[in-house]
C-alpha cells in the first residue's frame, strides 16, 4: 500500500512541478524593473524568455517578441534550452509513469516492467527538475551580474537595447515559480525512485518444508521459488509441485507479497 501511495504521490508532485516549469517558461516576468531607489516612472518594464513587455500606468500593455535568434545573448539561449529540455523530459516522464502506476493495470504487465518504468520516469523527473533549477539559476545569476553592472547607456544583454535611463532589472515571479516547480519535479522524481525499490521483487530464499498429510504424500521441493536476479528477468514465481501442477504464469495474477510494504 505504501509503495502505491509513494508512487501516486510522486506522480502528482511531478505533474504539478512540470506544469509549473511549463508555466514559468511561458511567463513574461522573468525579470522585472527594479522600483527600489529609482525615479517613479509611469511605465513598468518586464521581460521573459520569449518577449519583453511594457505596462503603462494607464493600463496599456505592449509586448514585443525577440524575433531575432542570432542576436540574443548565449546565456538566454542556454536558459531557453534548459527549460525546454526540462519540459520534454518531464512530459516523457509523465507518459512513462502513467503506465508504471500500480493502480493502473495494462494487459499482463509484470511488476518488474512497472518497476523499470517507475525508475525511468523517476530519473527523468529528477533530470527535468535539475534542468529547470539550472535554467532559472543561470538567468538569476545573469540578472544579478547585470544589476550591478547597470549604468546609463549600458547594453542590457537581454533584448539588445541601449538604455538611456538607468533601468535595473530584478527577479521576476517566473524565477520563483521555476525554482519551486523544479524542486517539486525533483522531489517527485525521488519519490518515484523510492517507489521503484518497493515494486521490484526482492531476492528471497525459502527453506524446504516437508510434511506428511493423510492419504497423500506431498513435498515442497527446495528451490521451489526461482529467485529474481534483477530488473528485466522473469520475476513470475513458479511453484513446482509433484505431478506438474500448472504454474502461476497460467493463472490470473493476484496481489503478491511484493505489492505491499
Amino acid at each position: 500500500m505504501a509503495v502505491t501511495a509513494c508512487q501516486g504521490l510522486g506522480f502528482v508532485v511531478s505533474l504539478i512541478g512540470i506544469a509549473g516549469i511549463i508555466a514559468a517558461t511561458c511567463m513574461d516576468q522573468w525579470s522585472t524593473q527594479d522600483l527600489y531607489n529609482n525615479p517613479v516612472t509611469a511605465v513598468f518594464n518586464y521581460q521573459g524568455l520569449w518577449r519583453s513587455c511594457v505596462r503603462e500606468s494607464s493600463g496599456f500593455t505592449e509586448c514585443r517578441g525577440y524575433f531575432t535568434l542570432l542576436g540574443l545573448p548565449a546565456m538566454l539561449q542556454a536558459v531557453r534550452a534548459l527549460m525546454i529540455v526540462g519540459i520534454v523530459l518531464g512530459a516523457i516522464g509523465l507518459l512513462v509513469s502513467i503506465f508504471a502506476l500500480k493502480c493502473i493495470r495494462i494487459g499482463s504487465m509484470e511488476d518488474s516492467a512497472k518497476a523499470n518504468m517507475t525508475l525511468t520516469s523517476g530519473i527523468m523527473f529528477i533530470v527535468s527538475g535539475l534542468c529547470a533549477i539550472a535554467g532559472v539559476s543561470v538567468f538569476a545569476n545573469m540578472l544579478v551580474t547585470n544589476f550591478w553592472m547597470s549604468t546609463a547607456n549600458m547594453y542590457t544583454g537581454m533584448g539588445g537595447m541601449v538604455q538611456t535611463v538607468q533601468t535595473r532589472y530584478t527577479f521576476g515571479a517566473a524565477l520563483f515559480v521555476g525554482w519551486v516547480a523544479g524542486g517539486l519535479t525533483l522531489i517527485g522524481g525521488v519519490m518515484m525512485c523510492i517507489a521503484c525499490r518497493g515494486l521490484a521483487p526482492e531476492e528471497t530464499n525459502y527453506k524446504a518444508v516437508s510434511y506428511h498429510a493423510s492419504g497423500h504424500s506431498v513435498a515442497y521441493k527446495p528451490g521451489g521459488f526461482k529467485a529474481s536476479t534483477g530488473f528485466g528477468s522473469n520475476t513470475k514465481n513458479k511453484k513446482i509441485y509433484d505431478g506438474g501442477a500448472r504454474t502461476e504464469d497460467e493463472v490470473q495474477s493476484y496481489p503478491s507479497k511484493h505489492d505491499y510494504v
Partner: antibody, heavy 117, light 113 residues
Framework: QVQLQESGPGLVKPSETLSLTCTVS????????VSWIRQPPGKGLEWIGV???????NYNPSLKSRVTISKDSSKSQVSLKLSSVTAADTAVYYC???????????WGQGTLVTVSS | DIVMTQSPDSLAVSLGERATINCKSS????????????LTWYQQKPGQPPKLLIY???TRDSGVPDRFSGSGSGTDFTLTISSLQAEDVAVYYC?????????FGGGTKVEIK
C-alpha cells in the same frame, strides 16, 4: 462618446478645502485613469495628480500634502480635494482621461475656481 | 522633477509656412523596454481645453491632420507644423509622461505673421 464634466463651487475662501467632481461617460473608470490639471489665468498647465484604473494614485509633490484624488466607479465620478487653499490656487481646473502613452486624450471643459475671501 | 523647457516662447509664421517648436527635458524620456519616448504634445486654443496632438513623441492621435508631426528622442524633441493654417493659431505644450510628476513645458504661442 467619451465625455468628462467638472463641477464644484466657483468660489472658495482661503484656508478652506476646494472640492471638485469629474463626472465621466463613455468609458469605465475601472479601465482608464483620470488626471487633474490646473491652469492659472494667463499661465501654463500644471499637473495635479492622477487616479489610475486600479485605484492607485500619483500626486505632484508640490501639492501632495494638500491633495486627495478618489473615485466612485459605480457613479462614474472622480473627486479632487485640495485643502488649505490660497489665492495661488485660483485656476481653471481640468479633468482628463489617460490613454496610450499615458497621454490625456479627452479633456473636460474646465471649471474656474477662484480663491477669495 | 523633470523640467520641460520649450522654445521659442512665441512664434510668428506665415500661412503655408513651416512652424517648428522645440522641447527639451532635463532627463531622458526614452523607455528602454519598448524604445518609446514618453513625450506628448497638446494644442490649446483660447477659451478651450487642451487637445491631444501627438503621444510617444511621434504618434499622431486619431483625427489629427498629418501636417502635424513629432520627432526627437531622449531629451530633445520637436513638433513641426509643415504648412501652417489659420486654425493652427494656439498655444502648444509638451509634457513628460514618463517620470512622476508628469510635468508640462511652459508653452509656445504660435501666431500668423
Amino acid at each position: 462618446q467619451v465625455q468628462l464634466q467638472e463641477s464644484g463651487p466657483g468660489l472658495v475662501k482661503p484656508s478652506e478645502t476646494l472640492s471638485l467632481t469629474c463626472t465621466v461617460s463613455g468609458f469605465s473608470l475601472t479601465r482608464y485613469g483620470v488626471s487633474w490639471i490646473r491652469q492659472p489665468p494667463g499661465k501654463g498647465l500644471e499637473w495635479i495628480g492622477v487616479i489610475w484604473g486600479d485605484g492607485n494614485t500619483n500626486y505632484n509633490p508640490s501639492l501632495k500634502s494638500r491633495v486627495t484624488i478618489s473615485k466612485d466607479s459605480s457613479k462614474s465620478q472622480v473627486s479632487l480635494k485640495l485643502s488649505s487653499v490660497t489665492a495661488a490656487d485660483t485656476a481653471v481646473y481640468y479633468c482628463a482621461r489617460v490613454n496610450f502613452g499615458n497621454a490625456l486624450d479627452y479633456w473636460g471643459q474646465g471649471t474656474l475656481v477662484t480663491v477669495s475671501s | 522633477d523633470i523640467v520641460m523647457t520649450q522654445s521659442p516662447d512665441s512664434l510668428a509664421v506665415s500661412l503655408g509656412e513651416r512652424a517648428t517648436i522645440n522641447c527639451k527635458s532635463s532627463q531622458s524620456l526614452l523607455n528602454s523596454g519598448n524604445q518609446k519616448n514618453y513625450l506628448t504634445w497638446y494644442q490649446q486654443k483660447p477659451g478651450q481645453p487642451p487637445k491631444l496632438l501627438i503621444y510617444w513623441a511621434s504618434t499622431r492621435d486619431s483625427g489629427v491632420p498629418d501636417r502635424f508631426s513629432g520627432s526627437g528622442s531622449g531629451t530633445d524633441f520637436t513638433l513641426t507644423i509643415s504648412s501652417l493654417q489659420a486654425e493652427d493659431v494656439a498655444v502648444y505644450y509638451c509634457q513628460n509622461d514618463f517620470i512622476f510628476p508628469l510635468t508640462f513645458g511652459g508653452g509656445t504661442k504660435v501666431e500668423i505673421k
